[in-house]
């Protein structure tokens, strides 16, 4: 029995509804009464969702997921999962059995924007050119891990004397802190870049140094 | 030819502790879930262990839990199960059997026996 | 006493039809699949059926069915090769555990 899944992940945004997409083709005269459909976590065989016997059995997966009754028998078994969380992250296998049996597995990758980097100085008065500041990129509530780049004013990228560190949150969402240390020229700009790889958005902080006072746009 | 061979039984006492393996062949073993299941002499057949393809989820028994341990080495396609404070009821021929993605366990071993006695 | 419920013995006569039943709940054979296994005397348990499947090389005088949170098994044209110890086994997700039938001791008379 040949069982069709998406190849590439769902991406799902925490807090919507994703929908896992599963099919099968069902033969001349099936009947719900033959089918059964069980969704599972590919990794440890946690049951998630199924249906058995002509009725949905319901989810066994914090009461979150939904299955599309009227279209089960035109061989669409497919998965609402609703308020997706962090945790909900990995593979999940689509397991029908009619006569025959047939399984496929879907990746859920979950995801969250990263908040506009705040950016903080220090020291951040009487800077003189040569004397050497630590700018810190804040950045929040993301998900998965994010990228940093630093860039000066004319886009070369700074690299050396970074420390970026990221701590998730009970929701399993990322906070992000990166630290440049750099030497002050006469002036110039410093510009923080956070990317998540996943939804290939950046947010953007940067801060400028012009002699007295500094400016934070 | 799709195999597994069982070795590592035999007689130990009891409170000892033994290591049985199960090398595979003729299929790709890092794709599959595996499973230990025994049979005490003249009895029906009881599920020990299983383990996921990568080794990362692991379930036992009510019976063995915390005293077996099941680990795989998919480079050298073997299942092992590490047996410790091992008990008088513990005897029996035990069996590795392949656990496909339909939760059917279709490819047996032919068996190892632990005899577990003072 | 175990989860899958088998009768301990079944027998029949050569060419005779034989059923072997397995009752479960909803949490093993109730959603998960229900496997067959043969047990000739001192070998290693062979599948026999899952479901209503049948590997290849399972004599078609074996089938399979499930209704609900029962299974049986069914023999027709019984030979005496056929004398065994059956085990039907499903994945128990209450468990998280594999369950077997106590086995059915089946006699060709």
């Known amino acids: 029995l040949e069982v069709q899944v998406p190849e590439d992940p769902v991406v799902a945004l925490v807090g919507t509804d994703a929908t896992l997409c599963c099919s099968f083709s069902p033969e001349p005269g099936f009947s719900l009464a033959q089918l059964n459909l069980i969704w599972q976590l590919t990794d440890t065989k946690q049951l998630v969702h199924s249906f058995a016997e002509g009725q949905d059995q319901g989810s066994a997966y914090a009461n979150r997921t939904a299955l599309f009754p009227d279209l089960l028998a035109q061989g669409n078994a497919s998965l609402r999962l609703q308020r997706v969380r962090v945790a909900d992250e990995g593979s999940f296998t689509c397991f029908v059995s009619i006569r025959d049996f047939g399984s496929a597995a879907v990746s859920l990758q979950v995801a969250a924007p990263y908040s506009k980097p705040s950016m903080t100085l220090e020291p951040n008065k009487d800077l003189r050119p040569g004397d050497t500041v630590t700018i810190t990129c804040s950045s929040y509530r993301g998900y998965p891990e994010a990228e940093v780049f630093w860039q000066d004013g004319q886009g070369v990228p700074l690299t050396g004397n970074v420390t970026t560190s990221q701590m998730a949150n009970e929701q399993g969402l990322f906070d992000v802190h990166s630290v440049l240390r750099v030497v002050l020229g006469a002036n110039g700009t410093y510009s923080c870049l956070v990317r998540n790889p996943v939804l290939q958005q950046d947010a953007h902080g940067s801060v400028t140094i012009t002699g007295q006072p500094m400016t934070f746009p | 030819e799709v195999q597994l061979l069982e070795s590592g039984g035999g007689l130990v006492q009891p409170g000892g502790s033994l290591r049985l393996s199960c090398a595979a062949s003729g299929f790709t073993f890092s794709s599959y879930w595996m499973s230990w299941v025994r049979q005490a002499p003249g009895k029906g057949l009881e599920w020990v262990s299983g383990i996921s393809s990568s080794g990362s989820a692991t379930y036992y028994a009510d019976s063995v839990k915390g005293r077996f341990t099941i680990s795989r080495d998919n480079s050298k396609n073997t299942l092992y199960l590490q047996m410790n404070s091992l008990r008088a009821e513990d005897t029996a021929v035990y069996y590795c059997?392949?656990?496909?993605?339909?939760?059917?366990?279709?490819?047996w071993g032919q068996g190892t026996t632990v005899t577990v006695s003072s | 006493q175990s989860v899958l419920t088998q009768p301990p013995s079944a027998s029949g006569t050569p060419g005779q039809r034989v059923t072997i039943s397995c009752s479960g709940s909803?949490?093993?054979?109730?959603?998960?699949?229900v496997n067959w296994y043969q047990q000739l005397p001192g070998t290693a348990p062979k599948l026999l059926i899952s479901?209503?499947q049948r590997p290849s090389g399972v004599p078609d005088r074996f089938s399979g069915s499930k209704s609900g949170t029962s299974a049986s098994l069914a023999i027709t044209g019984l030979q005496s090769e056929d004398e065994a110890d059956y085990y039907c086994?499903?994945?128990?997700?209450?468990?998280?555990?594999?369950?077997f039938g106590g086995g059915t001791k089946l006699t060709v008379l």
């Open positions: 909803s949490s093993n054979i109730g959603r998960r699949t």
């Open positions: 086994a499903s994945w128990d997700d209450s468990l998280n555990a594999w369950v």
């Open positions: 479901n209503s």
């Open positions: 059997a392949r656990w496909n993605d339909y939760d059917i366990m279709d490819v």
